[in-house]
């Protein structure tokens, strides 16, 4: 029962494909596809693939909701990761090992290398690989604030699980602060949630990168999966482009 | 340099207005405007205006973001409120007054009257009127779980303030649970956030409805502004309509 | 009395003029426009002789595709088999049968339209809507459509029966 | 919802999300994106009827608002509702870069 | 953003949010909604050019994508981006009801 013109589906698809061609270049602020003349032969480095997979996994976990997109968010974000300073570093000696907390420190020079300006950072996530957990545990994340004080950031209720699982905390504001300040090393603390009445405040959850006494090769694998910051930022050259172009809107 | 037809702005406006006519009736599941034959003379009752204003204030505080809207969310939601059981009720005697917590109980029969089926509830907010606060305070909200155990729900960092301010906690899941269970009275606890090291765990914040020793008339005003649950739910008759209509999507 | 017309000159615009009454106002509308129900605005009169598409039903979500005919008046559509009338997927639902709006559009009832060209004793004559001529290929597929007054019949070949929902002749499953 | 679950398994004529896989090499002639090789971009297509609401409303027509013109637009249009980002790997000179492009994958559509 | 701040103070010809106040009595002939008396519904209007991207890309064209076709649609359309709900008070019989209608006020638009 139709007198409608049939839609030329192929034309619509072609127009969509052509629009995507422009969209991707536009999001990357490229006038044309980048030259491939310097690309070395062979597959992508392992570290790059790991980073790509981290990002892809994050996307899969994201709710697919549209958000009003400020202009800066339209453009592509470079993804980098900065691993936690290894636990044998002297910085950890200053913080007494307690049953209720673990500490994670980051080198701000590495952060600055990845994100030169605080304003360029669009998202920072602290990623922790949580190992098996026998009981439910309520944990809290704190930011190192001043000499010996900690500022509460967020909390998470961890369900018991037989398999390891990545935990992700949004720490964008904190990392932006760190990039603005002069400190060399900054850190987080993951603690058991302590209620005012409760006495048992032990951190039961085992986070990869803190367990000691491993065989050499295992320790290396373990170390690769130690806590890290996943950073999404506008590359500096793209940001300068953003500022210099006059915007009507 | 235009060969475009000029847009008939008046026609577009008329079409938008006509579409809104249908949209409002459609959202209210009305086939035509409701009869006004039974409407009493005079202004709207105070309680209704207060409820309308609460809802309007909530809207103003909401971020104007589009959310993928499930079919049930398209239709209008009836707004009601259920006040906390007054503090002289015996239920409060069972919970020792502590420096770090206050308790809020609700009559589930009142909740059920407002929302007969758990599935009809689309949002429940616990609203507390926070009075002046001299220092920053980190508070936590708990739900009464079993005899003497409490389940953590959420937390809030309250900034110092000279003026009273409404606090709002999303407790949709909890109220949905309560509607499903048989209990007569259910409750929340607002506590100071207790860190594992800290000793000073006093709840500094003053919540309207808990301060004693007021003059009679003040106590009444005070009581009207005591904690309440703001409920948004699909009216039962509209829900039956929703279930009965066949949906291809 | 407040003169609403001088207080708000935009009342009744753009398709009419404002006329003040005691305690109220009404709109005097331009040609081709008619006052709204409350007489506080002017809306376009859908000329009965405008020809647009006739839509079969609103049950199917693809009703933009369920076009009975493409060049029919609102009366021809709504006073016969149509559920909606319009074009480019912009649809005026036909008034519900037996409502005041239906009687206003179809004063002679289902199956008839008024013919303003033929006037008997000052009253427009009604004529039967020939559904077969207007909708034949869509309402009597695989059969022979015969116009009746009012309505139509669809005759099917032996071994077939007419399915009133599908509007076509369907093989009898023996 | 007019999402991939509903639309890919139905023959919906009206507004719906439609399948479209883009292979960077085949469709765009690009070899410079090293990962992924392509992605399910999808797109929205199909009419969103505008229903002139008469004073005599009735349920059958009103029920259609939810799908066909929930935003009461003067000219409703089939557009993306839920979108997802796409991470890509490409080289700038000798340096491989991982970048995330926002709002690249259409998961569902709506009349708006 | 194509929001009320920008659009109401400019003469933007392209996609933008346009002012529209709806007075329930005057515009709809309705006296049954007791609160509010009307509301700023607004609406989206204006073209969203489709830019055929040629193999010879150049910055001038690419810069337009962000505004005119950020979603890389085959037929971009000016639609609401940020919406707000509207609470209303009306009577059912003798009983006053407060109800909230979702997505009624258009705050900003986008090409989608």
């Amino acid at each position: 029962l139709s007198t409608c013109k049939t839609i030329d589906m192929e034309l619509v698809k072609r127009k969509r494909i052509e629009a995507i061609r422009g969209q991707i270049l536009s999001k990357l602020r490229l006038a044309s596809p980048p030259s491939q003349g310097e690309v070395p032969p062979g597959p992508l480095p392992e570290a790059v693939l790991a980073l790509y997979n981290s990002t892809r996994d994050r996307v899969a976990g994201e709710s697919a909701e549209p958000e009003p997109e400020p202009e800066a968010d339209y453009y592509a974000k470079e993804v980098t990761r900065v691993l936690m300073v290894e636990t044998h570093n002297e910085i950890y000696d200053k913080f007494k090992q307690s049953t209720h907390s673990i500490y994670m420190f980051f080198n701000t020079s590495e952060l600055r290398e990845a994100v030169p300006e605080p304003v360029l950072l669009s998202r920072a996530e602290l990623r922790l690989l949580r190992l098996k957990l026998k009981v439910e545990q309520h944990v809290e994340l704190y930011q190192k604030y001043s000499n010996n004080s900690w500022r509460y950031l967020s909390n998470r209720l961890l369900a018991p699980s037989d398999s390891p699982e990545w935990l992700s905390f949004d720490v964008t504001g904190v990392v932006r602060q760190w990039l603005s300040r002069g400190g060399e090393i900054e850190g987080f603390r993951l603690s058991a949630h302590c209620s005012c009445d409760s006495r048992d405040n032990t951190l039961q959850v085992d986070i990869n990168g803190f367990t000691t006494g491993r065989r050499g090769d295992l320790a290396t694998i373990h170390g690769m999966n130690r806590p890290f910051l996943l950073l999404m930022a506008t590359p500096l050259e793209r940001a300068q482009h953003l500022q210099s172009s006059r915007h009507r809107r | 340099l235009s060969t475009c037809k000029t847009i008939d702005m008046e026609l577009v406006k008329r079409k938008r207005i006509e579409a809104i006519r249908g949209q409002i009736l459609s959202k209210l599941r009305l086939a035509s405007p409701p009869s006004q034959g039974e409407v009493p003379p005079g202004p709207l009752p105070e309680a209704v205006l207060a409820l309308y204003n609460s809802t309007r204030d909530r809207v103003a505080g909401e971020s104007a973001e589009p959310e993928p809207e499930p079919e049930a969310d398209y239709y209008a939601k009836e707004v009601t409120r259920v006040l906390m059981v007054e503090t002289h009720n015996e239920i409060y005697d069972k919970f020792k007054q502590s420096t770090h917590s206050i308790y809020m109980f609700f009559n589930t029969s009142e909740l059920r009257e407002a929302v007969p089926e758990p599935v009809l509830l689309s949002r429940a907010e616990l609203r507390l009127l926070r009075l002046k606060l001299k220092v920053e305070q980190h508070v936590e909200l708990y739900q009464k779980y079993s005899n003497n155990s409490w389940r953590y729900l959420s937390n809030r960092l309250l900034a110092p303030s000279d003026s009273p301010e409404w606090l709002s906690f999303d407790v949709t899941g909890v109220v949905r649970q309560w509607l499903s269970r048989g209990g007569e009275i259910e409750g929340f606890r607002l506590s100071a956030h207790c860190s594992c090291d800290s000793r000073d765990n006093t709840l500094q914040v003053d919540i309207n409805g808990f301060t004693t020793g007021r003059r009679g008339d003040l106590a009444t005003i005070h009581g009207m502004n005591r904690p309440f649950l703001l409920l948004m739910a699909t009216p039962l008759e509209r829900a039956q309509h929703l279930q009965s209509s066949r949906h291809r999507r | 009395d407040i003169d609403e017309c001088s207080q708000d000159p935009s009342l009744c615009l753009p398709h009419g003029a404002c006329k003040n009454l005691q305690g109220s106002y009404v709109c005097v509308c331009d040609e081709g426009f008619t006052p709204t129900q409350d007489q506080h605005g002017c809306e376009e009169v859908e000329q009965p002789h405008h020809k647009k598409e006739c839509y079969l039903n609103f049950d199917d979500t693809v009703f933009c595709d369920s076009v009975l005919a493409t060049n029919v008046t609102q009366q021809e559509c709504c006073c016969s088999l149509g559920a909606g009338w319009g074009d480019h997927c912009e649809i005026y639902p036909c008034p519900v049968y037996s409502s005041a709006e239906f009687h206003s559009l179809c004063p002679d009832g289902k199956g008839y339209t008024q013919d303003n060209n033929i006037v008997n004793y000052g009253i427009p004559a009604h004529r039967d809507i020939d559904e077969c001529m207007l909708f034949g290929s869509e309402i009597c597929k695989e059969g022979k459509c015969v116009n009746t007054q009012p309505g139509y019949e669809c005759y099917c070949k032996q071994g077939f029966y007419y399915d009133g929902n599908l509007l076509e002749c369907v093989d009898v499953d023996e | 919802a007019l999402d991939t679950n509903y639309c890919f398994s139905s023959t919906e004529k009206n507004c719906c999300v439609r399948q479209l896989y883009i292979d960077f090499r085949k469709d765009l002639g690009w070899k410079w994106i090293h990962e992924p090789k392509g992605y399910h971009a999808n797109f929205c297509l199909g009419p969103c009827p505008y229903i002139w609401s008469l004073d005599t409303q009735y349920s059958k027509v009103l029920a259609l608002y939810n799908q066909h013109n929930p935003g009461a637009s003067a000219a409703p249009c089939c557009v993306p509702q839920a979108l997802e980002p796409l991470p890509i790997v490409y080289y700038v000179g000798r340096k491989p870069k991982v970048e995330q492009l926002s709002n690249m994958i259409v998961r569902s559509c709506k009349c708006s | 953003a194509l929001d009320t701040n920008y659009c109401f103070s400019s003469t933007e010809k392209n996609c933008c949010v346009r002012q529209l106040y709806i007075d329930f009595r005057k515009d709809l002939g309705w006296k049954w909604i007791h609160e509010p008396k009307g509301y700023h519904a607004n609406f989206c209007l204006g073209p969203c050019p489709y830019i055929w991207s040629l193999d010879t890309q150049y910055s001038k064209v690419l810069a337009l994508y962000n505004q005119h076709n950020p979603g890389a649609s085959a037929a971009p359309c000016c639609v609401p981006q940020a919406l707000e709900p509207l609470p209303i008070v009306y009577y059912v019989g003798r009983k006053p009801k407060v109800e909230q209608l979702s997505n009624m006020i258009v705050r900003s638009c986008k090409c989608s």
Epitope: S35, P41, G42 | - | - | W32 | -
Partner: antibody
Framework: QVQLVESGGGVVQPGRSLRLSCAAS????????MVWVRQAPGKGLEWVSA????????YYADSVKGRFTISRDNSKNTLYLQMNSLRAEDTAVYYC????????????WGQGTLVTVSS | DIQLTQSPSSLSASVGDRVTITCRAS??????LNWYQQKPGKAPKLLIY???NLQSGVPSRFSGSGSGTDFTLTISSLQPEDFATYYC?????????FGGGTKVEIK
Amino acid sequence: QVQLVESGGGVVQPGRSLRLSCAASGFTFSDYAMVWVRQAPGKGLEWVSAISGSGFTTYYADSVKGRFTISRDNSKNTLYLQMNSLRAEDTAVYYCARVSSGHWDFDYWGQGTLVTVSS
Amino acid sequence: DIQLTQSPSSLSASVGDRVTITCRASQSISSYLNWYQQKPGKAPKLLIYAASNLQSGVPSRFSGSGSGTDFTLTISSLQPEDFATYYCQQTYTVPLTFGGGTKVEIK
């Protein structure tokens, strides 16, 4: 259209040197890595050497490492292969080819130039 | 170095035949494999890149498949102009290596 033209081949005695050139046209030369591939008479293809678009990075087959040098002059759109200490087993048709992408497929080839190393 | 072994080294076929040539790598090379066609006295011509992608301008009767260590070049219906020698090439790691070639002759 893309064109690659090799030159500089010929007969040379073992231990001597030869310089091959490849003139490129029809594309932005500096945007592409380039390679030399050779084919001994009646035999299969053997990759010899490669160079990145800027000339910054070079790669060699073990059989020629230390004897052959690949270079390019982007201002002249020309690729070179300097062959020193030539051996009889270096006798082959030498092709220059363009590296199409980061995948290192060779999408355009020259017609080849014959190098004969013989005493 | 990564060795590529092509089989068969030669084959005879008729016009219209379906022809399959295989290439096996001495270790996994993911999809970093290309196929070339070479006619006597001519330069090689790229047919397939990245194991399965048809180079622009190459007839669709040519197709490539495989990943890891085992790869296949298929000519769905052999044409007179397809009689030539076919080489596989890995670009997974330097040194880049070619297979020994497969000569397709007229039966």
